[in-house]
Interface confidence: low
């Protein structure tokens, strides 16, 4: 049987065919995607955007990254407020300090300590 | 379609500022790192910078830290970068150029910022 | 800042013919996380540079497949089989692995 490019399309992700020839064709791809049948997610990851550690997770034309505990944001750089998250952080009458990357205790009463239970 | 659009030429004198624009279509505008890099007449790129749009955070060239300022209005999806302080070596094309792949996948078409007295 | 070396500065092509490009980067471009960031472009005359291959060997969106790349670590080839009329400008090394980004100065291929 006769080969037509086009048909069926050998175009996969939603890429659209187009014959250039009579036994050559182009995928046109969508956003994200490569490859001569655009069969390839394009790895979007960057190496250096992801601050504080995160770690770069690829999507389809889109990249996020996965943050440590103390981090938020879509690039880590935002802080996380320990002090909201964890209301009896600090024991004792403790006063619970928002830092970047973390959260500290100040103690009275003489108790010490990181969580003032000392 | 990705299309990274930017204002057109300007003429400044020496210790001026300039302030360019970057629109940004067809992605997701938060997604994405924009960078500002620029060229010479006869050389090759230069990194300036690049901004987070959703967060604003920054980071810059040692070079042109203190004279560069980079900010987005995520409203209309437009980057800016602002320099000051122009000097004659400042006549240069500035590009915004949009993350990916660890690389700057699309590009604006440039914009020639001329310092002369 | 990372020195991106690129050979030659000129290089006189004939159309159909094949090209090779060095780009030399004073040190690794091995990433921590185990990629190499090192990336082509090519600048047609009165246009924005446009990527054509990114972390070594990757073809980006809509390149033909006469463009590859190899290399590692420092040394770093661009290869062009069967050069086109629009293949014609000049060609720019990026790395991206250590900051700043750095690119190289540039090869310009020309009609020979």
């Known amino acids: 049987s006769l080969y037509v490019p086009c048909a069926p399309s050998p175009c996969v992700n939603g890429g659209t065919c187009r014959q250039t020839g009579d036994f050559t064709f182009e995928c046109n791809c969508l956003p994200g995607f490569e490859g001569s049948t655009c069969e390839r997610n394009i790895d979007d990851c960057p190496n250096h955007r992801c601050q504080n550690g995160g770690v770069c997770v690829d999507g389809v034309n889109t990249y996020n990254c996965r943050c440590p505990p103390q981090w938020t944001g879509q690039f880590c750089t935002e802080d996380v407020d320990e002090c909201l998250l964890q209301p009896n952080a600090c024991q004792n009458g403790g006063t619970c300090a928002n830092r970047n990357g973390g959260y500290g205790c100040v103690c009275v009463n003489g108790w010490s300590g990181d969580d003032c239970s000392e | 379609e990705v299309q990274l659009v930017q204002s057109g030429a300007e003429v400044k004198k020496p210790g001026a500022s300039v302030k360019v624009s970057c629109k940004a279509s067809g992605y997701t505008f938060s997604n994405y790192v924009i960078h500002w890099i620029r060229q010479a007449p006869g050389q090759g790129p230069e990194w300036t910078g690049y901004?987070?749009?959703?967060?604003?955070?920054?980071k810059f060239n040692e070079k042109f830290k203190g004279r560069a300022t980079l900010t987005v209005d995520k409203s209309s999806t437009t980057a800016y970068m602002e320099l000051s302080r122009l000097r004659s070596d400042d006549t240069v094309v500035y590009y915004c150029a949009r993350d990916g792949a660890g690389s700057f996948t699309y590009w604006g078409q440039g914009t020639l910022v001329t310092v002369s007295s | 800042d990372v020195l991106m070396t690129q050979t030659p500065v000129s290089l006189p092509v004939s159309l159909g013919g094949q090209v090779s490009i060095s780009c030399r980067s004073s040190q690794s471009l091995v990433h921590s996380d185990g990629n190499t960031y090192l990336h082509w472009f090519l600048q047609k005359p009165g246009q924005s540079p446009q990527l054509l291959i990114y972390?070594?060997?990757n073809r980006f969106s809509g390149v033909p497949d006469r463009f590859s790349g190899s290399g590692s670590g420092t040394d770093f080839t661009l290869k062009i089989s069967r050069v086109e009329p629009e293949d014609l400008g000049v060609y720019y090394c990026?790395?991206?692995?250590?900051?700043?980004?750095?690119f190289g100065g540039g090869t310009k291929v020309e009609i020979k």
């Open positions: 901004i987070i749009p959703g967060s604003g955070g920054t």
């Open positions: 990026l790395q991206s692995t250590h900051f700043p980004d750095t």
């Open positions: 972390r070594i060997s």
